[in-house]
């Protein structure tokens, strides 16, 4: 690296600075940035992030486990969307399970776990985040086929379950591929006196290019692709529903608008911050104030983005009438089972089997319905 050839003398006013032209490399930073203390930002995230992550973890686990349990009890007539929802709930559960580690990391201000844990957790975190986003894309496509392409729908969705399982496998595989760089670059290392679990690009020849590439992939698969599909699919779904003479169409439109708005509200701020970060990577004249602002914004918008996995069960599952009915039945039956064990005189066995059989007969008619969630 000695004697880098890149010369910044052309940037200087030649009449007075010719004698101090500096071989400033592409990775140089404005001197002020090294004096700019982001201590107050770190103090804020030390307090805010662990609380926020803990809440997201609790509610995310609760909501998504309930979705999984409901699917486990719901034996018949699983549509493609139902399979996607189940996978999304699993992805969200795995995702929120990594949050306590990050909460501890933020609270202590250092990575206190091993290098292997660092790689593993960053990997799980990335895989499940990407997987969740790609599954949202699949759900919007499935709803598009079911509602807009209603005439072709029976032909397109005749082999529903096998196809959706294959699609889910592809989604998980794609998520692993997208996230593979996370395993490679993320590592535990000491920087500025404390251990961190961060991507380390110093091993590659073009660190900033790699950083931009990784950010680009995150933005593409974690935001732009799902957004494009959602806008396309839901625009046509709303058009179709507006034209349809159906009493339930307004509720369906409201659900769709809620889904899109929540996605945008949660994802746009964080992805805008990522875009600004990417745009700033090569810049030297960043001000201390703007760095602090980006620091605060990044912390808050990241929490907002993660909040999405708590809202997924509400938006995609609990909002649906059928899903709520099944879920309430399961709760009643579980309560019933508990009561049965408590008082031997009281029997619920008949009611339990009756409920389950009624469930299956009710849904058998709608075997090819889009999903019991909408």
């Amino acid at each position: 690296m000695s004697g880098e050839s890149m010369n910044f003398s052309d940037v200087f006013d030649s009449s007075e600075d010719y004698f101090v032209s500096v071989n400033t490399s592409y990775y140089s930073v404005d001197s002020e940035m090294l004096l700019c203390s982001l201590q107050e930002v770190r103090q804020f995230s030390r307090l805010f992030v662990p609380i926020a992550y803990s809440l997201i973890c609790v509610f995310g686990l609760l909501g998504n486990i309930l979705v999984v349990i409901t699917f486990a009890f719901y034996k018949k007539a699983r549509s493609m969307t139902d399979v996607y929802l189940l996978n999304m709930a699993i992805a969200d559960i795995l995702f929120v399970l990594t949050l306590p580690f990050w909460a501890v990391s933020h609270a202590t201000g250092a990575w206190v776990f091993s290098n292997a844990t660092c790689k593993l957790l960053k990997g799980i975190y990335a895989i499940n985040f990407n997987c969740g986003m790609l599954l949202l894309t699949c759900i919007s496509m499935d709803r598009y086929i079911a509602i807009v392409q209603a005439t072709k729908s029976f032909r397109l969705r005749s082999r529903t379950l096998p196809r959706s399982k294959i699609i889910c496998l592809v989604v998980w595989g794609l998520s692993v591929i997208i996230s593979s760089s996370t395993f490679v670059f993320n590592q535990k290392y000491n920087t500025q006196g404390s251990d961190v679990c961060e991507p380390k690009y110093q091993t590659v020849s073009e660190p900033i290019r790699w950083k931009l590439l990784m950010l680009g992939l995150e933005l593409l698969f974690g935001f732009f692709i799902p957004l494009m599909f959602m806008i396309f699919c839901y625009t046509f779904i709303v058009k179709t529903l507006v034209q349809a003479q159906n009493s339930k169409r307004h509720k369906a439109i409201r659900v769709i608008i809620a889904v899109v708005l929540v996605f945008l509200a949660c994802q746009i701020p964080h992805n805008m911050v990522l875009l600004v970060t990417a745009a700033n990577l090569g810049k030297m004249n960043r001000s201390c104030q703007s760095e602090k602002l980006i620091g605060y914004t990044k912390t808050v918008t990241e929490v907002l983005a993660f909040l999405h996995c708590c809202l997924n069960p509400v938006l995609y599952a609990f909002i649906g009438q059928k899903f709520r009915n099944y879920f309430l039945k399961i709760l009643k039956d579980l309560w019933c089972v508990r009561r049965k064990y408590k008082s031997s005189g009281f029997s619920c066995a008949g009611r339990y089997s009756e409920n389950i059989s009624r469930q299956t007969s009710e849904t058998a008619d709608n075997d090819n319905a889009s999903s019991f969630t909408m």
Epitope: F12, D13, V22, T24, S28, D30, Q192, Q289
Partner: antibody, heavy 117, light 112 residues
């Protein structure tokens, strides 16, 4: 021409105040940070602080906070370091230096000798 | 504050010899952004310091290629392949990874 022109020798009594100046070229003044470094006879260098005239931001070594104030005058492209409550410990050569990137000082003034007695 | 320690404090050399100056920091100088902000200066008697090398190993324009810098983390070295008379003076290492910026006490390069 010299890019950083510092004021000459400064003499002051203990407890008094003194203001050292450093004149930069317009380009340096508008584009970079200007720092002050202290050197006592036969000793090493000590960073006092830096001022960024374009934003007006100042950064100080905690050791001198309250003792030193850095200011900039846009009309004369000059930066100043003002001392208050001088003691014999403040006797030293003070260098003004340009800090463009990465926190290094690539060009230094000739130094101002401050004597407190 | 980060303490920068030089060794040796004085280095007597013959002209044409190789000289090696070591600098050790009390904390790692690897910044969170991946760069290491360690710089070398030379101060000749009665003069202001002059920057030789910035960010461990990058020579300033006009600095002869007999000067080279290396190291990482907390251990850094400045090498002069063939010492010339104009190289004599006090060499300082400095770090800007941490606030405040700090300098080493210096190594005096002198004729044997």
């Amino acid at each position: 021409q010299d890019q950083l022109q510092q004021s000459g020798v400064a003499l002051a009594r203990p407890g008094a105040s003194v203001k050292l100046s450093c004149k930069a070229s317009e380009y340096t003044f508008k584009s970079f940070g200007l720092g002050w470094v202290k050197q006592r006879p036969g000793q090493g260098l000590e960073w006092i602080g830096e001022i960024y005239p374009r934003s007006g931001n100042t950064y100080y070594n905690e050791k001198v906070k309250g003792k030193v104030r850095l200011t900039a005058d846009k009309s004369s492209n000059s930066v100043y370091m003002e001392f208050r409550s001088l003691t014999s410990e403040d006797s030293a050569v003070y260098f003004c230096a340009r800090s463009p990137y990465d926190g290094y000082f690539d060009y230094w003034g000739q130094g101002t000798t401050l004597t407190v007695s | 504050d980060v303490v920068m320690t030089h060794s040796p404090l004085s280095l007597p050399v013959s002209l044409g010899d190789q000289a090696s100056i070591s600098c050790r920091s009390s904390q790692s100088l690897l910044h969170i952004n991946g760069n290491t902000y360690l710089h070398w200066y030379l101060q000749k008697p009665g003069q202001s310091p002059k920057l030789l090398i910035y960010r461990v190993s990058n020579r300033l324009s006009g600095v002869p290629d007999r000067f080279s810098g290396s190291g990482s983390g907390t251990d850094f070295t400045l090498k002069i392949s063939r010492v010339e008379a104009e190289d004599l003076g006090v060499y300082f290492c400095s770090q800007s990874t941490h606030v405040p910026r700090t300098f080493g006490g210096g190594t005096k390069l002198e004729i044997k």
